[in-house]
Interface confidence: low
């Protein structure tokens, strides 16, 4: 037999319940048999009513949700903050890379600058969009950059005697760029570096954003009625007996929580794999898999590719002169 | 070595950033994130224990509540009795995960698959295809991970430029203005402009 309620008038229970639910009409004046109770099954007279029980269940589930939110708060903040920081950092890297590339053109090839700035800007805009998940092909981005640059290099540096560039010769030069491998293996090299580094960067950001989604979903889990009943028994049923100061047993709490969280704990295996896979990805993010390293070094590779064109300028001018003769003649008329 | 443009910014603009004691790179920041995430590796399996430890539980009291009655904290009744005549706890576990939980698991499965396919094979940072592009062995050390270019005039060498400074302080204020490489000014530990070495005639 449990000790009799210390307060024969349910006064303590009423004052506690008032904090949960203003309006005292649900609390009996004196202990009652409580035959209608479904959760806090009484072993004797009780200070609880069916309505109180329902309120306790609701409160227990709310408590549980709040505890869950506080449990995930630090983790959630960690991922949200880092996802934002990295996204901003990657945007800054792209902006610097664009500035470095523009500077290289301005300082070394001033005659190319107005158009080069435009092509470089378009390329790095595509890079940003790709990182954020756009459906753009990296090889196409790189090809477009070199396809656009070559006509300008040819007409401004290699054959400056030509009249203002016209679509005809530009199209011919764009074609010649690929056919004659005008830039050597540099475009392929840049494709490899850029696609590898951007792919990894994109997945890294995707993984962080998915981490946020997972924690957000965990945060808003709704617990079943069965769980609500278990929590009510654990946290509130003692009040019905007037035992206001008593706390649940530790082992009992663990059993209840494991019951309530049986589904949630199943996430554990996949969550572990997520962190370990992310670690593996991060460990590999260096050299050509590090977009910072690759993008900020791009301008020097582009510079070298233009030098390569210049070194082979004599032969190229002759070959292109023949290949695009038709277009050039049409231009002169 | 990689060539850097000579003039740092239009109008010789100077970029100065308050000195940060521990210079951070993006990669160090990534590693730091992973270390912190690893401290949450048991997040889901530890949730029941976390919630019990953050809700009122009898710790120093002699008596505690087991769901039905007041019992001694170390008695067998402390864990078991409260569960009698209740709905079946085993049944609760056997119901299978909630739809929301299944949704979380599916999302994690998907990203894990992506992460696995993207993970860089250990010790193989540069693809064979790149080796065949004419990268000369020896020019870049033991492995050719450092080489990221080849042409008649030698290798292109990349250095990580961006110092990932605390709170992303390092930012250019000229967007379309050409930039250059920053050097740490050795006198005042601020990043300032300086002439790059190696300019074409």
């Amino acid at each position: 037999q449990p000790p009799p309620p210390p307060d024969a008038t349910c006064h303590q229970v009423r004052s506690f319940f008032q904090r949960l639910q203003p309006g005292l009409k649900w609390v009996p004046e004196t202990p009652v048999p409580g035959s209608d109770l479904q959760v806090c099954l009484p072993k004797g007279p009780t200070c609880c009513s069916r309505k109180m029980e329902e309120k306790y269940q609701l409160t227990a589930r709310l408590n549980m949700e709040q505890l869950l939110q506080s449990a995930s708060m630090e983790l959630k903040f960690l991922i949200i903050q880092n996802a934002a920081v990295f996204q901003e950092a990657f945007e800054i890297v792209v902006r610097h890379a664009k500035n470095y590339t523009n500077a290289m053109f301005k300082n070394n090839y001033p005659s190319l600058t107005p158009q080069a700035f435009e092509f470089v800007g378009e390329f790095f805009t595509d890079v940003s969009l790709y990182i954020l998940g756009s459906d753009i092909n990296v090889d196409d981005m790189v090809n477009e950059l070199f396809d656009s640059l070559f006509p300008v290099i040819y007409t401004q540096m290699m054959n400056p005697g030509l009249p203002e560039s016209v679509l005809d010769i530009n199209e011919c030069l764009r074609g010649a760029r690929r056919d004659l491998k005008v830039f050597g293996s540099f475009p392929k090299l840049i494709m490899t570096q850029v696609s590898k580094s951007l792919q990894v960067t994109r997945i890294f950001l995707q993984a962080l954003n998915l981490g946020i989604e997972v924690i957000n979903t965990t945060d808003h889990l709704k617990f079943s009625k069965d769980c609500g009943r278990m929590l009510t028994r654990m946290w509130y049923c003692s009040y019905c007996q007037g035992l206001m100061m008593v706390k649940p047993c530790g082992g009992y709490c663990n059993v209840v929580m494991q019951g309530c969280m049986a589904g949630v704990v199943e996430i554990d295996k996949y969550w572990r794999e997520y962190i370990l896979s992310l670690e593996e990805l991060v460990n590999g993010m260096y050299r050509i898999y590090d977009m910072e390293n690759v993008l900020l070094g791009l301008f020097s590779t582009i510079h070298d590719s233009i030098q390569y064109v210049q070194k082979n300028g004599g032969k190229l001018t002759t070959t292109i002169g023949k290949l695009c003769a038709h277009s050039q003649q049409r231009q002169y008329r | 070595s990689a060539y850097y443009p000579e003039d740092l910014f239009i109008d010789k603009k100077i970029l100065k950033v308050a000195h940060v004691e521990h210079e951070e790179t993006l990669s160090s920041r990534r590693r730091e994130l992973i270390q912190k995430l690893k401290s949450f590796i048991n997040f889901y399996s530890a949730l029941p224990g976390y919630i019990c430890s953050h809700s009122p539980v009898a710790e120093n009291d002699t008596l505690c509540w087991n769901g039905q009655e007041l019992v001694e904290r170390y008695s067998q009744k402390a864990a078991r009795n409260g569960m009698k005549n209740q709905f079946n706890l085993h049944e609760l576990k056997m119901k299978g995960p909630e739809p929301v939980v299944s949704q979380i698991i599916d999302k994690l499965k998907h990203i894990n698959q992506l992460l696995r396919t993207m993970s860089v094979p250990k010790g193989k940072v540069l693809d064979k295809s790149l080796d065949e592009e004419g990268l000369e062995s020896g020019d870049c050390g033991d492995d050719e991970d450092e080489c990221i270019g080849s042409s008649g005039d030698g290798m292109v060498k990349v250095k990580n430029q961006l110092r990932f400074l605390a709170e992303l302080a390092y930012d250019l204020d000229v967007d379309d203005a050409p930039g250059n490489k920053q050097h740490g000014n050795q006198k005042d530990n601020e990043i300032t402009t300086s002439h790059s070495v190696g300019n074409m005639p």
């Epitope: - | 850097y4 490489k181 740490g184 070495v197």
Partner: antibody, heavy 119, light 107 residues
Framework: QVQLQQSGTDLARPGASVKLSCKAS????????ISWVKQRTGQGLEWIGE????????YYNEKFTGKATLTADKSSSTAYMELRSLTSEDSAVYFC????????????WGQGTALTVSS | DIQMTQSPASLSASVGETVTITCRAS??????LTWYQQKQGKSPQLLVY???TLAEGVPSRFSGSGSGTQFSLKINSLQPEDFGTYYC?????????FGTGTKLDLK
């Protein structure tokens, strides 16, 4: 002020390995490359290779691949060079030198470590 | 690798004189050339980079010139502290190579 402090004189047996150190101070160690240069008695200078402290990536002169291994410890701002399978040809003064910035121009040098390989 | 050849191999001069040391590269290195001074038992000191830019703290009596494959270092009004060995070095890609050295001693 910038300083590169190298380890003291070293004596080693043929076939052995030796690890020389170069402790940097007065600047951000991870921002600049550290090169190693060999000078045999009464002879010119030879570039061995360079280490990028931030990534720990080495970059060797082909001639010294397999002979030298360059490493760096960010926490102590120290660069290391290990020389293996030593022969009398490796007897020399070895300098570490800091990159000026974006090219192989060396603005600060260590005092040098004299290595003698003798049986 | 690019070969760097210095001439003369040695040179004697007096304080107050003007001397010129030359350096030739086996291929075009544009302006990617550096000059160092080394005194007996000491480490080299940077004098000039980019063929003609004087390093910080280097007296103006030193001047560098040239581009492509031919370079020279001129020292006006020699001072006692100027005696030692001078090395040129290209920084046009890897590996950077040094010249054979020019020993400047007191006549």
């Amino acid at each position: 002020q910038v300083q590169l402090q190298q380890s003291g004189t070293d004596l080693a047996r043929p076939g052995a390995s030796v690890k020389l150190s170069c402790k940097a101070s007065g600047y951000t160690f991870t921002s600049f490359g550290i090169s190693w240069v060999k000078q045999r008695t009464g002879q010119g200078l030879e570039w061995i290779g360079e280490i990028y402290p931030r990534s720990g990536s080495p970059y060797y002169n082909e001639k010294f691949t397999g002979k030298a291994t360059l490493t760096a410890d960010k926490s102590s701002s120290t660069a290391y060079m290990e020389l293996r399978s030593l022969t009398s040809e490796d007897s020399a003064v070895y300098f570490c030198a800091k990159d000026f910035g974006s090219s192989y121009v060396f603005d600060y040098w260590g005092q040098g470590t004299a290595l003698t390989v003798s049986s | 690798d690019i070969q760097m050849t210095q001439s003369p191999a040695s040179l004697s001069a007096s304080v107050g004189e003007t001397v010129t040391i030359t350096c030739r590269a086996s291929e075009n290195i544009y302006s990617y050339l550096t000059w160092y001074q080394q005194k007996q038992g000491k480490s080299p000191q940077l004098l000039v980079y980019n063929a003609k830019t004087l390093a910080e703290g280097v007296p103006s009596r030193f001047s560098g010139s040239g581009s492509g494959t031919q370079f020279s270092l001129k020292i006006n009004s020699l001072q006692p502290e100027d005696f030692g060995t001078y090395y040129c070095q290209h920084h046009y890609g890897t590996p950077p190579t040094f010249g054979t050295g020019t020993k400047l001693d007191l006549k």
